[in-house]
């Protein structure tokens, strides 16, 4: 299986569904197909209201039954642990793969949690996180934000992934914007020396 490194915002925007859910047990092989499915308990939907329509929730997450076909293998045995699942909708079913952005909710920084609930959506369809995996790399468009975590940190999990979103600054320009407290806030006043 091959997976491209993915910024959380890209995962959010490229997914049909983003939910919080708990895995309820071991996967069940679906006979005569190349799939298995995990029973899940959805606790919150963060993206996908339009795509889903009347559906109130998803009982199963479908994934290829083989790792070579990018099948997802759920390793946690803790049924009370809540996961963020960014998946695709196919024939009315939630599909996930080994490449899906799928992490324990508590592993996300508060800034990322807030972004999945609210902020990332503002960049979808407008801005593009453009991966820089080898130097030199340059922006191809003003709507792109250059993602350099792989170069600078040697990993897709870096400062831009954890703390920034690529958002419209104006109709023609996207820039990295800090997800936490404003970086431009004034410093506390220095105490006068005695």
């Amino acid at each position: 299986c091959s997976c491209a490194p993915t910024h959380p915002q890209t995962a959010f925007c490229n997914s049909d569904l983003v939910i919080r859910a708990k895995f309820m047990g071991s996967p069940e092989i679906i006979e005569t197909t190349l799939y298995q499915r995990y029973e899940i308990k959805m606790t919150k939907m963060l993206k996908g209201f339009d795509a889903v329509g009347n559906a109130t929730g998803f009982r199963f997450a479908y994934t290829p039954a083989m790792e070579s076909l990018c099948g997802y293998v759920h390793k946690s045995q803790n049924r009370s642990e809540e996961f963020l699942i960014a998946g695709r909708l196919r024939n009315g079913n939630l599909h996930i793969t080994a490449c899906s952005f799928l992490v324990p909710w508590h592993n996300l920084s508060p800034a990322q949690q807030k972004a999945f609930v609210k902020t990332y959506s503002a960049g979808c369809g407008v801005c593009t996180v453009f991966p820089c995996s080898a130097i030199p790399c340059k922006l191809e468009s003003d709507s792109h934000c250059l993602w350099t975590d792989q170069i600078l940190m040697g990993s897709e999990k870096g400062y831009q992934s954890d703390h920034f979103a690529c958002l419209p600054r104006n109709p023609d320009l996207c820039t990295w914007q800090y997800l936490g407290v404003s970086m431009t806030r004034s410093l506390p006043l220095a105490k006068a020396e005695a």
């Epitope: 299986c1 091959s2 799939y35 290829p64 070579s68 076909l69 599909h95 080994a98």
Partner: antibody
Framework: QVQLVQSGAEVKKPGESLKISCKGS????????IGWVRQMPGKGLEWMGI????????RYSPSFQGQVTISADKSISTAYLQWSSLKASDTAMYYC??????????????WGQGTLVTVSS | DIALTQPASVSGSPGQSITISCTGT?????????VSWYQQHPGKAPKLMIY???NRPSGVSNRFSGSKSGNTASLTISGLQAEDEADYYC??????????FGGGTKLTVL
């Protein structure tokens, strides 16, 4: 690097049997599905079936179920496609290819060079 | 099998851009999000050019690009060159995970 090497061209008469092969190298042969694809002269690609050499789990396209047999010998990293009784309409180029996952996609990422089978009286 | 429909032939002059379409029959949401494209020169094995609608494997020219709108995926070749003359096939997979091919499109470079 990943390589799939197929057996050579075959000329057969109707009613004869045939077994063609596809040897994999450069990757873990038992961990990936191998598919067989038919291309009749001047026509498009048709998926025939796939096999998982690790446990010989085999799935056939409905169009080819009962017409051919797909097998594998994992000890020599080789997959096979065989006919018990050939027909003139089996004349075609046959490709083996590795069935693989890319992100959410399922596709054939590496192909053998093809085996031309000619059936004529 | 699910039918993926492609035009039988397209043509273009060197330097031009051409687009080949691949239409699925299902209207299910995301039913054809997953489309790959193969190039096949006469007498040769197919070669993967695009996967997951718009991604290029390493080594494939950036003149090749993929996109999707509604139920139709498209392969666009810009700056057409003589060596692009070949047959092109789209491929997806059905709800069981099994592969499905389009009928193929013959590209002629005039």
């Amino acid at each position: 690097q990943v390589q799939l090497v197929q057996s050579g061209a075959e000329v057969k008469k109707p009613g004869e049997s045939l077994k063609i092969s596809c040897k994999g190298s450069g990757y873990s042969f038992t961990s990936y599905w191998i598919g067989w694809v038919r291309q009749m002269p001047g026509k498009g690609l048709e998926w025939m079936g796939i096999i998982y050499p690790g446990d010989s789990d085999t799935r056939y396209s409905p169009s080819f179920q009962g017409q051919v047999t797909i097998s594998a010998d994992k000890s020599i990293s080789t997959a096979y496609l065989q006919w018990s009784s050939l027909k003139a309409s089996d004349t075609a180029m046959y490709y083996c290819a590795r069935y693989y996952g890319f992100e959410y996609d399922l596709l054939f990422d590496n192909w053998g060079q093809g085996t031309l089978v000619t059936v004529s009286s | 099998d699910i039918a993926l429909t492609q035009p039988a032939s397209v043509s273009g002059s060197p330097g031009q851009s051409i687009t080949i379409s691949c239409t699925g029959t299902s209207s299910d949401v995301g039913g054809y999000n997953y489309v790959s494209w193969y190039q096949q020169h006469p007498g040769k094995a197919p070669k993967l050019m695009i996967y997951d609608v718009s991604n290029r494997p390493s080594g494939v020219s950036n003149r090749f690009s993929g996109s999707k709108s509604g139920n139709t995926a498209s392969l666009t070749i810009s700056g057409l060159q003589a060596e692009d003359e070949a047959d092109y096939y789209c491929q997806s997979y059905d709800i069981s995970g099994y592969p499905v091919f389009g009928g193929g499109t013959k590209l002629t470079v005039l």
